[in-house]
Amino acid sequence: VPGEAEQPAPELVEVEVGSTALLKCGLSQSQGNLSHVDWFSVHKEKRTLIFRVRQGQGQSEPGEYEQRLSLQDRGATLALTQVTPQDERIFLCQGKRPRSQEYRIQLRVYKAPEEPNIQVNPLGIPVNSKEPEEVATCVGRNGYPIPQVIWYKNGRPLKEEKNRVHIQSSQTVESSGLYTLQSILKAQLVKEDKDAQFYCELNYRLPSGNHMKESREVTVPVFYPTEKVWLEVEPVGMLKEGDRVEIRCLADGNPPPHFSISKQNPSTREAEEETTNDNGVLVLEPARKEHSGRYECQGLDLDTMISLLSEPQELLVNYVSDVRVSPAAPERQEGSSLTLTCEAESSQDLEFQWLREETGQVLERGPVLQLHDLKREAGGGYRCVASVPSIPGLNRTQLVNVAIFGPPWMAFKERKVWVKENMVLNLSCEASGHPRPTISWNVNGTASEQDQDPQRVLSTLNVLVTPELLETGVECTASNDLGKNTSILFLELVNLTTLTPDSNTTTGLSTSTASPHTRANSTSTERKLPEPESRG
């Protein structure tokens, strides 16, 4: 073509794959009549006629563009739909009159790659490899043109470095004409890279400008030999009997060595291997004082048969022994004195307290409790508590029963019980004394006796309410070697219909719905009579 060397650079048209390219013929009116134009595609310097414009009417030529071309803008623009990467070429329009002139358009096609897919080397990398090993592979699919890849470690771009970092990239052309890029990062890693975050970035261009896509961040398994093994005990701090204690072996290598935990036998001084669970953890549950001692961990690297030993660790399971009280079963006369002494052993300093069992009242802080001028009321339970103040929850207790010699002592002297004729009444009578008394009743019925504690007894009597019984009342008599004592229960008839909900706050009422000869639950809300009574 004459004068081709002086031709200006083609006009650049940029378009994304799949969209429509508008190829505007830039011939001026003086250069040619746009109603008479031929359009060509140029590929490898070969021109192919693809479209004719005659009298403003367009006609596609048979071939690859036949279905995708149309005229727009009153014939000045050729529209190419469904652009593909193969369309990246020069298109030219040639005016036929008054003389042959042409206008060239360079079509550039773009397609953003898919999100980069990163795959870490699942086998991991040993730190002492002689040359760079594969860290990860990055794949960017279906981009056009070929995107650029940049690898990052901990947010910093990685550069090629002889014998240290090597980036190996390759690409394949899909049938669609799009490129798939694969980039392999090879590097020599060090132990500190075990937590390093790697990712790849794809840089690509679109008609709108430069863009980039980042992969997710990955860490690569880094293998390095163990230099140190050590023991860790949970919970941290002071341990006590009953705790769940876990002793585990740890190592600074990856993979960790094969662990075993041993405890020194105090008599032979040999390290005896302990049985660990599937995770290699020695669980002491519940921990006992016998678990105290010197533990150590051995790590065996099965790849080299090198064995590593931890520093020994002393484990102390704090304890309080059984508490002993002397005298163990004290008996005293009224008016006398008593000294109770509490003893226990512990791995730590102990604190002692004496409490009254019935009330929980603290009587003494210390191992010795002195009781003077003993009264009958002083009989009963006393509890010694031995505790380690520095370890909450570490304590043991012992209960001692103090017996005061004396004749039976009744829980009540007299009591009024509301009853209905023909009901089966359940009466109870309680007495204490030392020696422990026995109880008898003055009426026939089914009686049962129950020891409440070493000095106290409770007797219950089931009896049918008869007119005679209403007249005589019921007596219970408690007796022991030192004497006897009696309680009287007065029986009074009640008309159940006259009862109000709170009438049982009067004097010991039995609110049983009773029919003749049926048992009524008459463990009456028995209350003492209003007048003062002697408890002798």
Partner: antibody, heavy 120, light 112 residues
């Protein structure tokens, strides 16, 4: 027959570097744990380094850690010991050794040794 | 670190004599689970490389004459040669592998 031949021993100045090699034959080199052991002029034996059969795991005593590097090339049936920051106390006969198939660390086979002298 | 102490440092014997040498470790070398001690004995004849004699404290390496016997457990070990031959004149080293690897200083066996 198992054969281990060390080479590379030399006279070197303190602070210098040296690389020892051990050519192995008569067994499947890539299947065995290999080690270096040295013997001082006072005839004391000292373990120097151990490497796993695949080369991924290495161990050293504190006396050489960070200065010596054991490596292997299973394709060439060769064991190496790269020594740097050498000290006069590194002067010794260096032996290449092979473990055996026991579940314990033993040096079952020894080479004839190569002499390393560190002196100003 | 585990320290290995050998005694005596040298020993002069006549051919045919029974000889014992000792090796003491600063801690027990017994693995209680497998009931084995991580201790080996090596022999080094003049001008030669060391040679493995015994491992697991008492297991003879194949090819080692049965006049060599290893015994002991925990921290105290003994190598006994029931009837010394001229070819037994050498330095004998014990080595522990319970925690890394350390050798004893050796016991030198000489002829009277």
């Amino acid at each position: 027959d198992v054969k281990l031949v060390e080479s590379g021993g030399d006279l070197v100045k303190p602070g210098g570097s040296l690389k020892l090699s051990c050519a192995a034959s008569g067994f499947t080199f890539s299947s065995y744990i290999m080690s270096w052991v040295r013997q001082t002029p006072e005839k004391r034996l000292e373990w120097v380094a151990t490497i796993s059969s695949g080369g991924s795991s290495t161990y050293y005593p504190d006396s050489v850690k960070g200065r010596f590097t054991i490596s292997r090339d299973n394709a060439k049936n060769t064991l190496y010991l790269q020594m740097s920051s050498l000290k006069s106390e590194d002067t010794a006969m260096y032996y290449c050794t092979r473990d055996d198939d026991y579940d314990v660390k033993v040096f079952a086979y020894w080479g004839q040794g190569t002499l390393v002298t560190v002196s100003a | 670190d585990i320290v290995m102490s050998q005694s005596p440092s040298s020993l002069a014997v006549s051919a045919g004599e029974k000889v014992t040498m000792n090796c003491k470790s600063s801690r027990s070398l017994l693995n209680s689970r497998i009931r084995k001690n991580y201790l080996a004995w090596y022999q080094q004849k003049p001008g030669q490389s060391p040679k493995l004699l015994i491992y697991w404290a008492s297991t003879r390496e194949s090819g080692v004459p049965d006049r060599f016997t290893g015994s002991g457990s925990g921290t105290d070990f003994t190598l006994t040669i029931s009837s010394v031959q001229a070819e037994d004149l050498a330095v004998y080293y014990c080595k522990q592998s319970y925690n890394l690897l350390t050798f004893g200083a050796g016991t030198k066996l000489e002829l009277k």
